[in-house]
């Protein structure tokens, strides 16, 4: 209709980075930009994804290097994290959120793909990391090894080997394990503090240089108390599980202090593993009963999990695996290991800004049934798995509904703001839910719509439209881009209109009748009034049309609804040669060239395209007859 197809601005980028996967218009104090997601962009050796800022009229795009943003205190893995897969603009302050739903971090032997987002302020500066699903690793442990270095320990090299071997089993790194070592005899010394080394390699290197300090007395109680009161303080982390490993070869010379020392360790929640080395007793034929009782007293209960004894120093190597396994069985404490909560949640797969924060779709949450999380300045709201049971019953829990594949919100005059989320794999046909979130981690689900066709991916794209601009949502559009019809993946967009409190189905939008795959409804954008009739409009992308070149459809709003026949279909081939997947993303909220008309930004594979609006001239014809 009135979108100019002759002089588009085609902004080139990397196809391999999928520059153009997401696009957003951006305004900084009157300067207009496009923010373009390139989720496969490379940073150094890692395919982190990134976001570009592109000037609207001319000039080159600049990478924001958000892929370099690092989270401290986690062992993160940023490769393939898909930064830019979702973008959400906050029109209030012109900040935006760029998400990396496949961002993961190392936890023990696992990588947890919790996802994370970067908040970027209006002048393109990174301001904050948003990662509501990020939880502390179960391997978030401060481990202090308390080594008896008194004269009777022999040969020391065996103790060293044991130390090195056990350290090699530890997942040492930010957000995981820290290790400190103290050695005692008559006195106690720090060999190294908890925060001295940040990798297994460095800790092992330091441990290999620990020499036996000797001493005629074995002050085990003092060694334990020193570890509790000093070693866990120097470099210890708030909230880290405290683990102490005591290795000794004889009764302590301060055993009457053990009761108080152990009580204090219990109060500090220090889990104690104790290893009795019987070499001295066996070499001299002494009954070790009193010694063994003492070591069992030192070890946390139950003894069978925390107490070890070895025949001599050389036999220490035999307990390395068992000790390591026992320590890491702490990982699974009170957890059902067959099920995932937020560990694989992929938070930020979709994002949507609301008044008090941001909604983030987490398709991998709760065993890939999905969830929607909310981050606000006051904290985060993570609904419990049970909150969704009304619409996502237990019997379908292994189906992987992917709730949160897309998120948005609607406003009704009765209920105010209500959140909307799509679950395109629910029961194979897809589902959309409308809900409100509560701070007690529960949800109220007000309405649910179900897809018709298996595999249609109903709910993978959702857009709410306020046609008349009165602040109340008029229409909810739900895409099912894989809808199969006439032997092809044609796609379908369902129209729901708000009647009192419910959205009522009111047909589908019409696409063109080609005989190729189209995926009509892969992207749906509510855009501001394009044709200057004072009604807001809608643009739908069909990125597989015309042999994957892509096309977009413009639908006009009219009197609280939407006209179901497109007013304009724009194909990629009209605009430039070589465009592919044109229409995979769409945004149209700003006048980019200051002609008073709203312009469109459309993403394609390796390109972002700006389409300029043309003015609409309305001619009112009137006839006058003379003589009348």
């Amino acid at each position: 209709f009135n979108m100019d197809t002759r002089k588009p601005r085609v902004i080139p980028g990397s196809r391999t980075a999928f520059f153009g996967y997401t696009v957003q218009q951006h305004d900084i104090s009157g300067n207009k930009w496009l923010v373009v997601g390139a989720p496969l962009e490379t940073n150094g050796y890692q395919k982190t994804g990134d976001v570009y800022k592109c000037p609207v009229i001319h000039g080159n795009c600049t990478k924001l290097n958000l892929g370099r943003v690092t989270l401290s205190n986690v062992s993160e893995r940023k490769d393939n994290m898909r930064l830019g897969l979702s973008l959400a603009t906050n029109p209030k302050d012109n900040s935006f959120l760029a998400c990396s739903p496949l961002w993961s971090h190392e936890c023990g032997s696992s990588y947890y793909t919790t996802g994370m987002c970067s908040r970027v302020n209006s002048n393109f500066r990174f301001s904050k990391t948003v990662a509501p699903a990020l939880q502390r690793c179960q391997t978030y442990m401060d481990i202090v090894i308390v080594l008896d270095g008194s004269n009777s320990i022999y040969p020391w090299v065996e103790v060293q080997h044991f130390l090195i071997n056990i350290l090699k089993k530890f997942y040492i790194g930010p957000g995981q394990i820290q290790v400190g070592v103290v050695q005692y005899g008559e006195d106690v010394v720090h060999e190294f503090h908890l925060n001295d080394y940040r990798s297994v390699k460095d800790v092992v290197e330091a441990a290999s240089h620990i020499e036996q300090r000797g001493g005629t007395e074995t002050r085990t109680a003092f060694g334990i108390e020193f570890a509790r009161s000093e070693a866990f303080q120097k470099g210890g982390r708030k909230g880290a599980k405290k683990v102490m490993i005591v290795i000794t070869d004889g009764e302590s010379h301060d055993s009457p202090d053990l009761e108080k020392v152990i009580q204090q360790s219990e109060r500090d929640n220090v889990t104690r593993y104790a290893v009795a080395v019987l070499g001295y007793y066996n070499r001299r034929g002494i009954n070790p009963e009193t010694f063994l009782n003492e070591i069992k007293y030192i070890a946390s209960d139950p003894d069978d999990k925390h107490f070890f004894n070895v025949t001599d120093e050389a036999a220490l190597k035999d307990i390395v695996d068992a000790l390591g396994d026992r320590i890491f069985s702490l990982e699974g404490t009170n957890k059902n290991e067959t099920s995932f909560g937020l560990e694989m949640s992929q938070t930020g797969f979709s994002s949507h800004v609301v008044e008090d924060g941001v909604l983030l779709g987490a398709v991998g949450a709760y065993d890939w049934n999905g969830a929607v999380l909310k981050e606000t300045s006051a904290g985060k709201v993570i609904p419990l798995r049970e909150s969704y049971l009304k619409e996502f019953p237990e019997e379908l829990k292994n189906h992987g509904a992917y709730l949160g594949y897309t998120v948005t919100s609607v406003v009704s005059s009765r209920q105010g703001r209500v959140y909307v989320a799509g679950a395109p794999r629910f029961n194979h046909t897809g589902k959309v839910i409308l809900f409100t979130m509560h701070n007690n981690r529960s949800l109220t689900i007000h309405q649910a719509m179900r897809g018709q066709q298996i595999g249609s991916y109903f709910g993978s794209e959702i857009t709410s439209v306020d046609i008349d601009g009165d602040g109340v949502t008029d229409v909810l559009l739900v895409g099912a881009p894989m809808y199969f019809n006439e032997g092809r993946e044609r796609g379908k967009v369902y129209v729901y209109e708000l009647r009192q409190n419910l959205f009522v189905y009111n047909g589908t939008l019409k696409d063109s009748h080609s005989y190729q795959n189209a995926r009509f409804g892969s992207s749906i954008a509510s855009v501001r009034d394009l044709n200057q009739d004072s009604y807001n409009d809608v643009v739908v992308g069909a990125p597989l049309e015309d042999n994957h070149a892509g096309a977009i459809y413009i639908f006009h709003g009219f009197r609280g609804s939407i006209l179901k026949t497109p007013k304009q279909r724009i194909t990629a081939s009209e605009l430039a040669t070589g465009l592919q997947y044109f229409g995979c993303s769409i945004h149209g909220q700003l006048d980019l060239n200051e002609d008073g008309l709203i312009d469109l930004a459309v993403g394609a594979l390796g390109n972002a395209v700006i389409l300029w609006s043309r003015p609409v001239v309305q001619i009112n014809a009137s006839l006058h007859f003379e003589p009348s």
Epitope: E217, S252, S255, P256
Partner: antibody
């Protein structure tokens, strides 16, 4: 030669205070525990308090808890028993004794005792 | 708290007699039980430690044994210098709380 010598005993009025000293020689106070044990006239031995000179951990009998304080000054190789709010029933001979690993946690050396009389 | 019940509270015996004094612990305890001898006006002296180990310088006629929660001091052949009061003492494991028995006075018959 190991020796323990108590001093500081005497006559005190009920409610009064007294500080007993136990000077150790022939061994390092740091490597042992000191216990105070008392014996009322014609009665048996009653354990009073103990201290680890190294860690400063203390233990007290219920009968003296909150009134008596045991301490040690390793630089002087001396242990102390500060007795406050004294009562008539605290009248006894007070002994200090060494307790350590090498005697398998028995009181192997005792002082000669010092008499504390609480009377108005 | 563990109580140590010593019996008898007194006994009369003659030189050359075999004398047995028993201490019963109110609950299961470690072997950290010691026996002391005290003569009037003197400080107690250690005889036996760890229930059955003879302290250095103590005559071999003194011996100690354990059976469950019962601890026994035996003087195999009573000598004139052995007339005194005997105390058992138990050390609470891993603390320096100690408990004495009430004492047994061994008198000349």
């Amino acid at each position: 030669e190991v020796q323990l010598v108590e001093s500081g005993g005497g006559l005190v009025q009920p409610g009064g205070s007294l500080r007993l000293s136990c000077a150790a020689s022939g061994f390092n106070l740091q490597s042992s525990y000191i216990h105070w044990v008392r014996q009322a006239p014609g009665k048996g031995l009653e354990w009073v308090a103990s201290i680890s000179s190294y860690s400063s951990y203390t233990y007290y009998a219920d009968s003296v808890k909150g009134r008596f304080t045991i301490s040690a000054d390793t630089s002087k190789n001396t242990a102390y028993l500060q007795m406050n709010s004294l009562r008539a029933e605290d009248t006894a001979v007070y002994y200090c004794a060494r307790y350590w690993y090498y005697s398998a946690w028995a009181l192997d050396y005792w002082g000669q005792g010092t008499l504390v009389t609480v009377s108005s | 708290d563990i109580q140590m019940t010593q019996s008898p509270s007194s006994l009369s015996a003659s030189v050359g007699d075999r004398v047995t004094i028993t201490c019963r612990a109110s609950q299961s305890v470690s072997s950290a039980v010691a026996w002391y001898q005290q003569k009037p006006g003197k400080a107690p002296k250690l005889l036996i430690y760890s229930a059955s180990s003879l302290y250095s310088g103590v005559p071999s006629r003194f011996s100690g044994s354990r059976s469950g929660t019962d601890f026994t001091l035996t003087i195999s052949s009573l000598q004139p210098e052995d007339f005194a009061t005997y105390y058992c003492q138990q050390s609470a494991p891993y603390s320096s709380l100690i408990t004495f028995g009430q004492g047994t006075k061994v008198e000349i018959k």
